[in-house]
Interface confidence: low
């Protein structure tokens, strides 16, 4: 006996977020795997009076506390359908079926006499048919549903005179059904018995404060599971050849501070006077454990040396509980002022650290939805997924000898102190109906798959590939607005006059009357900003540079009235200087935040985009930047992330779909202007950039979800690129779903209606399409009501915990980009497009693991979508350059200009032009490389300011 | 983003029944994590718990006012309603609705949003 | 019923360090959660689960619970504390919300 699972807080010092087999893990299970489901009889046989059988203390238990319940007589009747509950098993594919006896089915004063008839043909026919389909019975004897007659006659679980009555039940059992059955568990999770039957009074029979009834019950059930337990290994054990257990059900806890050893300390206490309270006589030295015996001393009873050597060791296996009726109510849990936590592997190594590694069985596990879900639990999916995954983790990566896993539960049913306001059934019953028809959830459809793959086969996505970009590919990095400097950092060299230094005097500078000197002109490396820009650039060793003009600040009347010469000249400056390193600017006009809209004050004040005269105004704005700056630079984008800018305007879903048309329109303006006037000359391209994410549903046993991805796509993207990329007006999915919404009184939402004249001048204003994508979106079809963009999609999005995720909570879904690139060609056809900002936030300040793994991982996908889906993609440009003070870490620097570690990985990505096979030589041209220049570096380092 | 906004009238006279709407944004009542609170603050006094509405509609009431309180939904509509029956002086205050989100179980991690408050009187 | 006990006023100069507390019978086993409440607005949770912050709320707030007393401890007291502070837990027996009586910070100065 080891007892040393407090070590388990002591965090492994070798996690890392981005192995995401640490996180979640595509493998399988091992090959005998158990596969299994349970029910507890109580929970869904219903027939509490039927064919002479008698009352539980559930049952009584039901009709003097439970308000608005009238009986478990209702809930999935399985005593009368049970050929559809063998249906269901069938369905699903499991090994082995997990069901409880029901004690007073059987023997209706809870005595050993003759056995009701009809309950004892009732569990051998299930019995026999289970044997027929190769599913393994393992057989509860009590899931808590205690024959009324032993509470009233001897006070229940309280009075050891229980003890020998459950043994003679037992005997019974092994007698009539241990031909058929090889797992026995003799009592399900005693904590829950003990705790809430007789100290919280939530459970029958209802008693409450009473803390030496509590331990003394506890005591009880113990020593009639270690009785039940010798009796079986003495006299059945030899010819039947099964084995044994007592389920044992527990919560999961962490500390508050990692590193604190009182918050370990109560961490350990928590799980010992829980989990520990049962598992140290059975599974450990045959004694409850030291701190329980020390705090309760006075309630605890005490084992004498015989009994404890009697108590050691009668359990054939390990059988764990971990779902709901452990976790809730918590504040009736022994919390300890800690976290709890869902952390199923944490706690399967706690059980492994403490009682020296025992085979386990999980023998219930799973979580709850609300009871009004029917068949499309997505949730549910989810934690299964996570707690599956757990398991996995647990037996693959800590050597965890799991052997068996019980999926709770087969039936939605009657579920203890929450009676039927929730359901944890995998299978769905409508329980006013006749029939009780199971039917299939999500869930059941989801562990099917788990169950026929024996784990999680990796589908998502292919294996990586060797190969590279093409020469001109753009390697880009993207920066939000440069604000640009007023007043050059530097004037030395622009004042003409001599001065001498008083320095005996008055200490101060006396200009020099009569002495002129030469000054020079201005010069870009005037401002300091630009040279800590391009010390960055050229250590990124990228072939281009996106960032954002200040509108506001360039134009801060909105018109041409009067224009900032400065703020051009220090933009022109960033463009020809990056020029001098061989980088070329991708120019954005407008890049509005979350937080800022970045509009001129006048426009602002006149309405922003809600306003038609903004897109006019914006048309004025690009002309003069296209005149000052276009003859350097070649990339144009009108507007980034229009689509987002339903983040601001959303009072209504009319002002959202308002701003979008102004903001299409002044691209549209834009566009017309450059081809018509600038391009002649300039040859330069212009689009606008997109929020891109891709989405995925959420569940994907839901054809709900299927069409609430698209939707999303349809709302997020086709919103705008349907008029500018193809026909000139709206998605006709989109303004038939709003319009739809709108007959149906569910939204005042309507999409403008676009003249012809409009919709010829938004068609084909784009000369590439340019996506900013950072993830993917996992959705879920929800109707709701309100007249806003967001309640418009009736979408709602669902966080995979099991994925790797940043700070933000930014999934990491590399062929989630490949999907998007493959939509974008089969929707809009085979032109060239650029990801304009990629990136995800990472909170290292130097080795930013989590950014290397998403660059290199999601390049992987776009070098697939070039080389296989023969996608003409010709740019990336990573999000981005610098981080700002206090916002989310997506930048390659930080706030103060400290380079991370992921500039060399994506260094030695640029310089391979991708994933090259290993000694591949397929260099280009020099005029098409963008070689690193030593001297130029040098001097943008060195040159004075 | 999620809001709350409380209305009803601002007089009630003794004896009468009042009614609270509170209308929510941002998320949807249907959410089985979510459950909403009527808490009310008499002037220059302390908060006090009034009804709560879970996910599941299940219901729970403070036990001084039990009698004349009832809380109820209409997910469509975005809304919780609360009645309070047989207004008195006393019960002069400014009522305020509430978000609580679950994370584990039925565990709730406070009230995470509040509306701004309607202020109530109750006189003749 | 469950009762929370909180002093009526806690008075601390700007810059210093203010502990408000929150009894209750065995307290360290619930979930306890803080709220600031400035005069004429509505209560803004400051802590929950205990010891968590929200977003956007400084860190300079913090909370700790065990035995029979949890505390909201406000480092660094600036003027712009100054408002009622209210503990509340849920009574998972009886299913009700619970808060404390309140307590008033006062910045000195």
């Known amino acids: 006996f080891s007892g040393d699972g407090r070590a388990i807080w002591s965090k492994n010092p070798n996690f890392t977020p981005v192995n995401e087999s640490q996180l979640f893990l595509y493998d399988t299970f091992p090959k005998n795997f158990f596969w299994g489901i349970g029910t507890g009889a109580l929970q869904v046989e219903g027939s509490w009076k039927k064919d002479g059988k008698g009352p539980s203390i559930w049952d009584h238990f039901i009709h003097t506390h439970l308000k608005n319940v009238s009986s478990t007589n209702g809930s999935s009747d399985s005593y009368i359908f049970l050929e559809k509950d063998l249906s269901a098993l069938d369905f699903i594919g499991v090994s082995f079926y997990q069901f409880s006896i029901s004690w007073p089915r059987l023997f209706p004063d809870g005595i050993v006499t003759v056995a009701n008839a009809k309950g004892l043909q009732y569990y051998s026919t299930l019995l026999d048919a289970l044997v027929l389909r190769n599913i393994e019975p393992i057989v509860t004897l009590y899931h808590w549903d205690l024959p009324l007659a032993l509470q009233e006659k001897y006070g229940g679980w309280k009075n050891d005179t229980i003890i020998d009555i459950f043994n003679d039940y037992a005997t019974y059992c092994f007698q009539m059904f241990g031909d058929r059955v090889k797992y026995w568990i003799t009592i399900h999770n005693p904590y829950l018995v003990a705790w809430h039957g007789y100290g919280t009074g939530m459970h029958a029979p209802g008693e409450k404060g009473n803390l030496a009834a509590v331990y003394t019950v506890g005591h009880n059930l113990i020593k009639a599971h270690s009785k039940v337990w010798h009796n079986y290994n003495t006299h059945f054990r030899p010819h039947q050849k099964g084995w044994l257990s007592i389920t044992l059900g527990s919560h999961w806890i962490e500390p508050n501070r990692s590193e604190n050893t009182m918050d370990i300390f109560k961490c350990q206490q928590s799980m010992v006077s829980v989990l520990g309270w049962f598992a140290n006589p059975i599974h450990g030295d045959g004694d409850y454990p030291e701190g329980m015996r020390k705090k309760l001393f006075s309630v605890l009873p005490i084992f004498s040396e015989a009994e404890k050597h009697e108590m050691r060791g009668t359990a054939d296996f390990f059988a764990f509980s971990f779902g709901p009726n452990n976790f809730k109510p918590l504040n009736t849990m022994a919390k300890m002022g800690q976290n709890v936590s869902l952390n199923l592997r944490e706690a399967l190594n706690w059980i492994k650290l403490e009682y020296n590694n025992p085979r386990i069985l999980i023998a219930e596990n799973g979580w709850f939805t609300d009871s009004r879900v029917k068949t499309e639990d997505t949730t549910a999916i989810y934690m299964m997924k996570n707690f599956l995954s757990q398991v996995l983790q647990a037996i693959r990566l800590d050597e965890i000898r799991v052997f068996g896993y019980t999926a709770w539960s087969l039936l939605d049913g009657f579920e203890w102190q929450d009676a039927y306001t929730i359901r944890r059934g995998l299978f769905y019953v409508d329980f006013n109906s006749k029939q009780k028809e199971r039917k299939p959830k999500s869930s059941a459809h989801y562990y099917k798959q788990i169950i026929r793959e024996n784990g999680f086969s990796l589908k998502e996505s292919t294996p990586d590939v060797q190969g590279q970009f093409p020469c001109d590919f753009s390697w880009g990095v993207t920066e939000s607005v440069l604000k640009p400097e007023s007043v050059a950092s530097s004037p030395q060299f622009s004042d003409p006059h001599l001065y001498v230094w008083n320095a005996t005097g008055n200490r101060l500078l006396h200009r020099v009357e009569g002495v002129r000197l030469k000054t020079r002109p201005a010069q870009c490396t005037d401002f300091v900003n630009i040279k800590k820009q391009l010390e960055m650039l050229a250590r990124m060793k990228v072939t281009h540079y996106r960032f954002a003009l200040d509108w506001a600040s360039v134009l801060p009347t909105g018109n041409l009235s009067a224009v900032n010469r400065q703020a051009l000249r220090y933009y022109r400056c960033v463009v020809s200087e990056g020029l001098k390193l061989g980088i070329s600017a991708m120019v954005t006009l407008y890049y509005p935040t979350h937080a800022h809209l970045g509009l001129p004050e006048p426009l602002l004040h006149a309405d922003g985009w809600l306003n038609p005269s903004t897109a006019e105004a914006f048309q004025a704005y690009a002309g003069l930047c296209f005149q000052e700056l276009g003859d350097l630079v070649k990339l144009w984008i009108t507007i980034n992330e229009p689509n987002r800018l339903s983040d601001i305007y959303n009072r209504s879903g009319n002002d959202t779909y308002g701003a979008a048309h102004n903001l299409l329109v002044a691209h549209a303006l834009a566009w017309r202007l450059y081809d018509r006037q600038f391009r002649p000359s300039q040859r330069g391209a212009v689009s606008l950039s997109l929020h891109a994410d891709w989405a995925e549903p959420a569940n994907p046993y839901a054809d709900s979800h299927w069409r609430a991805a698209e939707r999303f796509l349809q709302f997020e993207i086709a919103w705008f690129a349907e008029p500018l990329f193809k026909t000139g007006d709206y998605p006709a999915a989109m303004r038939e779903y709003i319009a739809s919404k709108h007959r149906r009184g569910l939204s005042s939402s309507a999409l403008p209606r676009l003249t012809e004249a409009e919709r010829r001048l938004l068609k084909g204003t784009v000369d590439f399409c340019a996506l900013n994508h950072f993830t993917t979106r996992f959705v879920m079809h929800e109707q709701l009501a309100g007249s806003r963009y967001d309640s418009d999609r009736d979408i709602q999005f669902l966080q995979d915990i099991t994925r790797l995720s940043s700070p933000t909570r930014l999934a990491v879904i590399p062929w989630g980009v490949r999907k998007l690139l493959r939509w974008v060609r089969r929707n809009y056809g085979d032109m060239d497009i650029y990801i304009t900002a990629s990136g995800i936030d990472d909170q290292a300040l130097e080795d930013d693991r989590l950014r290397k793994y998403y660059l290199g991982k999601y390049l992987q996908e776009v070098l697939k979508a070039y080389l296989i889906d023969k996608v003409r993609i010709k740019g990336y440009y990573a999000f981005k350059l610098a981080e700002e003070k206090s916002k989310p870490r997506f930048g390659f620097f930080t706030s103060d200009f400290k380079a991370k570690s992921s500039i060399q990985f994506y260094n030695k990505v640029i310089s391979s032009r991708g994933f090259p096979f290993e000694n591949s030589s397929s260099r280009c041209s020099q005029t098409q490389e963008n070689t690193e220049c030593t001297v130029c570096l040098f001097l943008v380092q060195k040159k004075p300011l | 983003q999620v809001t709350l906004k409380e209305s009803g009238p601002v007089l009630v006279k003794p004896t009468e029944t009042l009614t609270l709407t509170c209308t929510v944004s941002?998320?949807?009542?249907?959410?089985?994590?979510?459950?909403v609170s009527w808490i009310r603050q008499p002037p220059g006094k302390a908060l006090e718990w009034l009804a709560h509405?879970?996910?599941?509609?299940?219901?729970s009431y403070s036990t001084s006012l039990k009698s004349r309180l009832t809380i109820s939904k209409d997910t469509s509509k975005s809304q919780v309603v609360l009645t309070m029956t047989n207004m008195d002086p006393v019960d002069t205050a400014t009522y305020y609705c509430?978000?609580?989100?679950?994370?584990?179980?039925?565990?709730?991690?406070?009230?995470?949003?509040w509306g701004q408050g309607t202020t109530v009187t109750v006189s003749s | 019923s469950y009762v929370l006990t909180q002093p009526p006023s806690v008075s601390v100069a700007p810059g210093q360090t203010a502990r408000i507390t929150c009894g209750g019978s065995n307290i360290g086993s619930e979930s306890v959660h803080w709220y600031q409440q400035k005069p004429g607005q509505a209560p803004v949770l400051v802590v929950y689960d205990d010891s968590d912050r929200p977003s956007g709320i400084p860190e300079r707030f913090s909370g700790s619970n065990s035995g029979n007393t949890a505390t909201l401890t406000i480092s660094r007291v600036e003027a712009g504390d100054e408002a009622d502070y209210y503990c509340?837990?849920?009574?998972?027996?009886?299913?009700?919300?619970?808060f404390g009586g309140g307590t008033k910070l006062t910045v000195l100065g």
């Open positions: 509340q837990v849920w009574d998972g027996n009886s299913d009700h919300v619970v």
């Open positions: 509405i879970f996910s599941n509609d299940e219901k």
């Open positions: 509430a978000r609580s989100v679950v994370t584990g179980g039925y565990y709730y991690d406070g009230m995470d949003v």
């Open positions: 941002g998320f949807s009542l249907n959410n089985a994590r979510v459950g």
